[in-house]
Amino acid sequence: APVPPGEDSKDVAAPHRQPLTSSERIDKQIRYILDGISALRKETCNKSNMCESSKEALAENNLNLPKMAEKDGCFQSGFNEETCLVKIITGLLEFEVYLEYLQNRFESSEEQARAVQMSTKVLIQFLQKKAKNLDAITTPDPTTNASLLTKLQAQNQWLQDMTTHLILRSFKEFLQSSLRALRQM
């Protein structure tokens, strides 16, 4: 027989919300990915001492991870909605190869890494619908990505651990900057 509602005090229910707007959905999707990154970072930091390492610069030189710069129009000073949106989408597309690299880097969190990768693909789709100037978005070259992936996978264990840590940290920072910028749009 059906259990009457409210019988179990540990049930978690939220109020009935109105339909999500496009902006709300993007905002929530970014926060969803950030939550997933936290889970991956937790495993990385537990597994190695990379999170406290001061030798990051050595590995960072080999990586060309997307970063927000003043010219991208995403900061409060010199904010430009269209330029910034193009930067966010382009940056996310550039991060995809690094998220692919993460797929084989987690023993106990294989599905977690996959979830972060797939939820990022969904975010890119949401943002592409929002963008008016899709022509300005450059898609990374698949051949270049393939050779980058091979190069990253050929690194020694220490560098692979450092690369994993840097990707997660940079991706988190990029998403946080994107979230702040999108809230101004």
């Epitope: 229910a13 959905r25 599905e111 939820s119």
Partner: nanobody, 129 residues
Framework: QVKLEESGGGLVQAGGSLRLSCVVS????????IAWFRQAPGKEREFVTT??????????????YYADSVRGRFTISRNDAKNTVFLQMSSLKPEDTAVYYC????????????????WGQGTQVTVSS
Amino acid sequence: QVKLEESGGGLVQAGGSLRLSCVVSGRTFSPYTIAWFRQAPGKEREFVTTIIGSDRSTDLDGDTYYADSVRGRFTISRNDAKNTVFLQMSSLKPEDTAVYYCALTGKGYVFTPNEYDYWGQGTQVTVSS
């Protein structure tokens, strides 16, 4: 291996209520999205409602979304201790008759069946007039 199992379906009169349950086992990622979909005979599978879950305490945890056709009549909730998601259905109408499925994904705020990776077998709900 992720597994979902629904229960609680049955035959009910229009205006009545039912509470469906979905037990989730084997999930290894967080956050996650659990949704209820339904499929009436000869129709496409359609989204009913979703709830976000997280192993960390974030403000997304417990966030819900409903299809227009059920908003105000159906309520989704979950009990983490029992790894169970509930669908409380009230003021049922004959057009609510369908097989109800629960599904899980790690893709986020997605509301179409093809975005869901894991599915239960479904439970039949029949509303008579």
